[in-house]
């Protein structure tokens, strides 16, 4: 599930790469669409660049 | 050896469009962001747009969204950024970047990259 | 937008001097998640861009300890220990805090 939230967007590393896993845990994308809009990857999870890197090896 | 190869870059008029691709090789595409820079004529640099390591989440500037789209396909380890309505002020050296990794840096390998001129 | 702001414009050191590069931020570039994403970058003449530091202070693999990042905030400096002739280039503060990321406008640095 991906929610949205607050607008800081930073980090962008490796992890969605795992195409065949599914994470049914990860928080992070900051924005619930395809696209960004004024705002950064900010994950509620703490986890870093987690707007970037969306599944968990 | 990491590396990324930009190709596409053209002259083209106002309103046009254009396809930028990068072709990476040498580590694993498909667990890292990608994301595009531009410097500008005057040797500013100015990100464009990021994609997250799967593809499924895209992050652009105000100037550009809506005009460009990033992508990316794993199986051919090739980025892209379709680019319309383009502007003179898109006219740039458009670089293709990795990501370092979610604790490392943005831009931690560069293509030599592609050069864009909108002109009429 | 953060308006990244580098000085000088223009750096002149003879070599084995010390530089020092200053980058302010408009506003804070610390993440809610806690990290600083400051990050600087050397572009040689004629060169694609290249990573030095990350996270402020972290140096990217190969790069020489003679490079070392610092600050806080909003203030934030790169400093060369000893300038070798393969330094010289331009220099770019980047922040990946808060979108749309951002660079500064670059530090030249020249023999003097």
């Known amino acids: 599930p991906i929610s949205a939230f607050a607008v800081d967007i930073p980090e962008t590393h490796g992890g969605e790469g795992y195409e065949d896993e599914i994470d049914d845990e990860y928080e992070g994308d900051w924005s619930n669409s395809s696209s960004s809009t004024s705002g950064a990857g900010d994950p509620s999870s703490g986890k870093e660049k987690s707007w970037l890197y969306t599944l968990d090896p | 050896e990491v590396q990324l190869v930009e190709s596409g870059g053209d002259l083209v008029k106002p309103g046009g469009s254009l396809k930028l691709s990068c072709a990476a090789s040498?580590?694993?595409?498909?667990?890292?962001?990608m994301s595009w820079v531009r410097q500008t004529p005057e040797k500013r640099l100015e990100w464009v747009a990021s994609?997250?390591?799967?593809?499924?989440?895209?992050y652009y500037p105000d100037n550009v969204k809506g005009r460009f789209t990033i992508s990316r396909d794993s199986a051919k380890k090739s980025l892209y950024l379709q680019m319309s309505h383009l502007k003179s002020e898109d006219t740039a050296m458009y670089y293709c970047?990795?990501?370092?990794?979610?604790?490392?840096?943005?831009?931690?390998?560069w293509g030599t990259g592609t050069t864009v001129t909108v002109s009429s | 937008d953060v308006l990244m702001t580098q000085t000088p414009l223009s750096l002149p050191v003879s070599l084995g001097d010390q530089a020092s590069i200053s980058c302010r931020s408009s506003?804070?570039?610390?993440?809610?998640?806690?990290?600083?994403?400051l990050e600087w970058y050397l572009q040689k003449p004629g060169q694609s861009p290249k990573l030095l530091i990350y996270?402020?202070?972290n140096r990217f693999s190969g790069v020489p300890d003679r490079f070392s990042g610092s600050g806080s905030g909003t203030d934030f400096t790169l400093k060369i220990s000893r300038v070798e002739a393969e330094d010289l280039g331009v220099y770019y503060c980047?922040?990946?805090?808060?979108?749309?990321?951002?660079f500064g406008g670059g530090t030249k640095l020249e023999i003097k």
């Open positions: 970047t990795k990501d370092g990794g979610p604790r490392e840096g943005y831009f931690d390998v």
């Open positions: 040498g580590f694993t595409f498909s667990n890292y962001a």
């Open positions: 994609i997250s390591d799967g593809g499924s989440y895209t």
């Open positions: 506003q804070s570039i610390v993440h809610s998640n806690g990290n600083t994403y």
């Open positions: 996270k402020v202070s």
């Open positions: 980047f922040q990946g805090s808060h979108v749309p990321y951002t």
